[in-house]
């Protein structure tokens, strides 16, 4: 392992929202774990990076991810509210020059090496739908979230507000 040591009904026109400026409003390192306290880890295998969801052994160090938060402006004519709205979008980078990407065709979450400006597939709308947990919704595919499937990260379609609290799309961030 290595480190650097809504829903369609609720989400409209995400792909049209403009990210305010090109600089993140804040960045920090955190470990990512599931609702059930399994760790998200990253490993180099056959010259590509794999993402795993696993129980760590006692005292095993958690991988850290650089979370970069961006503000995204929603003009009032798109928001449906009659007011300009703002969202938080996040990119996740577990090591230099690599970012989590949504592969909507394969319904998978992958690590890709890329340069800035990052493609839309690397941006996720941040939700906190549950106490002290967050969810990551694809900017490119509203209603699709990063989730856990068979000990891997995958893209999961959430089709109703009731499912926004499904445990497999909830993650915890920890800076310790």
């Amino acid at each position: 392992a290595f480190g650097i040591s809504g829903v369609q009904k609720y989400t409209r026109a995400l792909h049209d929202s403009s990210i305010t400026g090109i600089s993140p409003i804040t960045e920090y390192l955190a470990s990512l774990s599931t609702y059930n306290d399994q760790s998200i880890t990253f490993a180099l295998e056959d010259e590509s990076y794999e993402i795993y969801v696993e129980d760590l052994k006692k005292d095993e160090k958690k991988d850290k991810v650089l979370l970069s938060y961006y503000e995204s402006q929603h003009p009032s004519n798109e928001s449906g509210d009659g007011v300009d709205g703002k969202m938080l979008m996040v990119t996740l980078s577990p090591t230099k020059d690599f970012w989590l990407h949504a592969n909507n065709k394969e319904h998978s979450v992958e690590l890709h090496k890329c340069e800035k400006p990052l493609p839309d597939q690397a941006f996720f709308v941040l939700h906190n739908m549950h106490s002290n947990c967050v969810s990551f919704e694809c900017k490119t595919d509203p209603g699709v979230f990063i989730g856990v499937k068979d000990n891997h990260l995958a893209l999961i379609k959430v089709d109703s507000s009731e499912n926004l609290c499904t445990e497999n799309i909830l993650f915890k961030l920890s800076e310790t």
Epitope: Y10, I25, T26, M87, L88, L126, M129, C165
Partner: antibody, heavy 121, light 107 residues
Framework: QVHLKESGPGLVAPSQSLSITCNVS????????VHWIRQTPGRGLDWLGV???????SYNSALMSRLSISEDISKSQVFLKMNDLQTDDSAIYFC???????????????WGQGTLVTVSA | DIQMTQSPASQSASLGESVTITCLAS??????LAWYQQKPGKSPQLLIY???RLADGVPSRFSGSGSGTEFSFKISSLQAEDFVIYYC?????????FGGGTKLEIK
Amino acid sequence: QVHLKESGPGLVAPSQSLSITCNVSGFSLSKYGVHWIRQTPGRGLDWLGVLRAGGTISYNSALMSRLSISEDISKSQVFLKMNDLQTDDSAIYFCARDHYYYSSFGGFASWGQGTLVTVSA
Amino acid sequence: DIQMTQSPASQSASLGESVTITCLASQTIATWLAWYQQKPGKSPQLLIYAATRLADGVPSRFSGSGSGTEFSFKISSLQAEDFVIYYCQQLYNTPYTFGGGTKLEIK
């Protein structure tokens, strides 16, 4: 124009329950969380709970057994119910809207005017 | 729960001066901190969010800094209407706790 307005009973007898309505306009409850906060001269500002976009609810665990938050999306209303009120629950009760869609990380951008609740026999 | 310790509880200053208020979190809160202003008989108003970001319509004489557990809020060139109460609030974890407030008084 974003607007939130609380309406409450004013006076509540000890051991009785409190019901407050927050009427909202200018934004959608399906995009923004609405929080309940109360303020007393002695304790300052206390966060009570939130009805998040999508309908999930988080409470302050210290008051969780006495609190209930709900909504009527069709009427753009959020409700706070609190049971077994005591004199130290006397406070101004506010509802407030998240700054960001779907997330509370940006603080509370719009607040209601507040409603004064006095618990007294 | 995360405790927010705000200091000073009150401060006297003159028009045109600068003042700084600090807020200490009992554990790391990244940059998820907001500052509010409350005028007498009114509800709090968001001034700063995400520790450093100025809310819409807020004058540039207000600024915020810090991350982790230590945060500062500065008002440069105090105006008459600034002599009110200011609160910090952490948005990192529920319950979203507030500092005890700082009352700015005119000297």
